[in-house]
Structures are given as structure tokens and as C-alpha cells.
């Protein structure tokens, strides 16, 4: 009954669990026997240029419960939120609240999701309803993307979900892809 307060957008944040918690252990699964050799997807960065690689952006660790209607994940999941402006790596502060944002006088760079992974979650429901199993997409890494004059303010508002959809990853790091519905909301929170 107490769960009715949770939003139905899978963004319930629990900062008390720490700003940089360890990611939850991966669920056990037996995929080793039937894996395609070299089946991963090669990296593909259509927007990256030499100067983009010199920029860096914040990856804020987020711990939260996943919700689906009245149901909530049995355990919290940890993901990243891509935060704010990009700047030269050497000028970026190490933590929130220290230093000043560096703003380029020339082209604008934004910190956006680069890669996603999928994670299995079990959702517990109130009132004796049967538990649910879902797979959720979580941000795995962020990147700086150079904005062009074609990106207007309305596009920026929804930048995390439309303007630069992240790609799928490849081994060795488990990653998935696709724009999360509420990434822009989380970005704006910072």
C-alpha cells in the first residue's frame, strides 16, 4: 500500500545509498556455450572528431529502484546519469560542487548517453499480485557530443532521448542501447 507513492516512470532515486555505490552483481546466466565468436558490435562514433576526444563529461552514479505501475524492483539498480556541459578533461572538477563549469567560447558540447546495457530485474507487487520480470535498459557510459547550429533549444530539451541516440555496445563490457524515456528528465535534475 505504501508503494502507491512511487512514480510510474522508473526514476525513484535513493541518494542515501551513496553517490558512488558499487554496481549490483550481474545475474547469473549460462551463455558461454553458445556465444558467437567475435559477435560483438564494433564501436561506431559518427560524431566523434579529434577535438571531441579531448573533452570529458561527468558520469554521475545513480542508485534507484525500478518501478512498473505499483510494482517495484526487489533490489535497487545502479546506473549512470550523464551530467551537464563538457569541457577539457584537465579543467573538469572531480566531484560535484567543486570548481567551476568550463564553457567553451566556440562550439558547444553536451554530455549525453553513449552506451546502454540491459539488466534483468524482478519487480515485487503489492496486494498479493504476482511478481513481474522485466529487462530494463540502463546507461552504461556517457560521451561528449559536439552540437551543431542545427540543434535548436527544443531539441536540446529532449537531448538525451532524441538528438543523439546511443549505440549498442560490444564485449568485453556488457552494454545495450536505445534512448531511455526519462534520461532528459534526469539530466535536467542536475
Amino acid at each position: 500500500q505504501g508503494w502507491q507513492a512511487f512514480k510510474n516512470d522508473a526514476t525513484e532515486i535513493i541518494p542515501e545509498l551513496g553517490e558512488y555505490p558499487e554496481p549490483p552483481p550481474e545475474l547469473e546466466n549460462n551463455k558461454t556455450m553458445n556465444r558467437a565468436e567475435n559477435g560483438g558490435r564494433p564501436p561506431h562514433h559518427p560524431f566523434e572528431t579529434k577535438d571531441v576526444s579531448e573533452y570529458s563529461c561527468r558520469e554521475l552514479h545513480f542508485t534507484r529502484y525500478v518501478t512498473d505501475g505499483p510494482c517495484r524492483s526487489a533490489k535497487p539498480v545502479t546506473e549512470l546519469v550523464c551530467s551537464g556541459q563538457c569541457g577539457p578533461a584537465r579543467l573538469l572538477p572531480n566531484a560535484i560542487g567543486r570548481g567551476k563549469w568550463w564553457r567553451p567560447s566556440g562550439p558547444d558540447f553536451r554530455c549525453i548517453p553513449d552506451r546502454y546495457r540491459a539488466q534483468r530485474v524482478q519487480l515485487l507487487c503489492p496486494g498479493g499480485e504476482a511478481p513481474r520480470a522485466r529487462k530494463v535498459r540502463l546507461v552504461a557510459s556517457c560521451k561528449c557530443k559536439r552540437l551543431t547550429r542545427f540543434h535548436n533549444q527544443s531539441e536540446l530539451k529532449d537531448f538525451g532521448t532524441e538528438a543523439a541516440r546511443p549505440q549498442k555496445g560490444r564485449k568485453p563490457r556488457p552494454r545495450a542501447r536505445s534512448a531511455k524515456a526519462n534520461q532528459a528528465e534526469l539530466e535536467n535534475a542536475y
Epitope: R165, Q167, K168, K171, P174
Partner: antibody
């Protein structure tokens, strides 16, 4: 909206290979998990393999391991499924299918129109 | 490899209710198999009705529902319509590898 358009029908001889293409529009291929499913005439659906976003790899069904290769050309947003050492029982309609772009991972939401591959001597 | 079993054929009267089931040779079907249900009509590609046991899609008619029943995945059709006559396939996820059932041919009499 994701749309998948597959290449046309093929007739192959036993022992040959076939490469079926699946062109994605509406989204980019790198955003999607592409899977391949086949259906022999009058028979049921059979999963051949696809991209697994949990570990970022392509996984093949045991039955096709070593005989099937699934690749992608991200510059043209086209996925390919190549099946080698063809035999008559590989005669089937081959489908590509992808997930949706959203918060929850849902596979097999969008399907190509199918490509009929006939293996005959 | 696991074998997924379905009833080969079922019949329902218009307006009636029918339940299709989907079993696994490995034992009980659970939510961790993320059961999918597909509908396929002759000459058409399949279309997804249910994902993750019970999750309907925007195009899924309300008369279809998914559940777990007696150790199997189940698709229940309440208030069958003539247009529901089709082949229905279930699909189970075995740790990233998928296996389809043999399909159930559903006939709507009338």
C-alpha cells in the same frame, strides 16, 4: 516507428550460401537488437540467433552454430544473415525482427516482410 | 536444447474463452523465461501480442491476456472473434537464447 525491409527471394543449390539483408529505417541499427527467425513451409517459427544487449554479443542457436553468421553494416543501417552449406531443409521464409526503442527491453516487436529462400538442385 | 510445447490445435466458439499453454522440457515455466506470445495469420509475418509473461502491446486487443498457469505460460482469449483465427506461438528465453513452441492453430467456429 521502426520499419524493416528485407531483400528479395533467392533460389540456391545445396552446398551454397545465402545472404539475406534487412534494411532498418526509423531508427539506426545500432539502437536495435536484431534477431533472425525462420519458418519452413507449413512449419513453425525457429529462432536462429540475434544480438543480446545483456552482454553485447550476438548469440546463435546451437542448431545453426558454425553455419550462420549475422553481421551489420551500420553505415547503411542494414543487417545481414548468411547461412552456409545449404540443404533442402533450409528452404524457408527468413525473417528479421527487432526490439522497440524504449525503457523496457522488448524483443521481436517489429518484423520484416520475410525472404523466401529455396534450396533446390 | 530445450523443447517448448504447445497444443497443436484448439477450437473456440465466437464469444467464448480459450486458454493456450506453453510448457518447457526443462521444467516449470517462470517469469524468468520472459514468455512471449505471437499471432500469425496465413501469408503474414508474426506479430507480438504479449511480452514478459503478461505485458500487452499497444496493438494487442484487450481480450488477450498472458499469465502463468500450472507451471506453464498461458495465453487466454476471452470473447473470441472470427479474426482471432490464426496460429499462435509462444517463445521462451533461456538466458539469452530463445526457443519457439510448435504453435497452436486456433479455430474460431461459426
Amino acid at each position: 516507428e521502426v520499419q524493416l525491409v528485407q531483400s528479395g527471394a533467392e533460389v540456391k543449390k545445396p552446398g551454397a550460401s545465402v545472404k539475406v539483408s534487412c534494411k532498418v529505417s526509423g531508427y539506426t541499427l545500432t539502437e536495435l537488437s536484431m534477431h533472425w527467425v525462420r519458418q519452413a513451409p507449413g512449419k513453425g517459427l525457429e529462432w536462429m540467433g540475434g544480438f543480446d544487449p545483456e552482454d553485447g554479443e550476438t548469440i546463435y542457436a546451437q542448431k545453426f552454430q558454425g553455419r550462420v553468421t549475422m553481421t551489420e553494416d551500420t553505415s547503411t543501417d542494414t543487417a545481414y544473415m548468411e547461412l552456409s552449406s545449404l540443404r533442402s531443409e533450409d528452404t524457408a521464409v527468413y525473417y528479421c525482427a527487432t526490439d522497440t526503442v524504449g525503457y523496457w527491453e522488448k524483443f521481436f516487436q517489429h518484423w520484416g516482410q520475410g525472404t523466401l529462400v529455396t534450396v533446390s538442385s | 536444447q530445450a523443447v517448448v510445447t504447445q497444443e497443436p490445435s484448439l477450437t473456440v466458439s465466437p464469444g467464448g474463452t480459450v486458454t493456450l499453454t506453453c510448457g518447457s522440457s526443462t521444467g516449470t515455466v517462470t517469469i524468468d523465461h520472459y514468455p512471449y506470445w505471437f499471432q500469425q495469420k496465413p501469408g503474414q509475418a508474426p506479430r507480438t501480442l504479449i511480452s514478459d509473461t503478461d505485458d500487452k502491446h499497444s496493438w494487442t486487443p484487450a481480450r488477450f491476456s498472458g499469465s502463468l498457469l500450472g507451471g506453464k505460460a498461458a495465453l487466454t482469449l476471452s470473447g473470441a472473434q472470427p479474426e482471432d483465427e490464426a496460429e499462435y506461438y509462444c517463445l521462451l528465453d533461456y538466458g539469452g537464447r530463445f526457443v519457439f513452441g510448435g504453435g497452436t492453430k486456433l479455430t474460431v467456429l461459426g
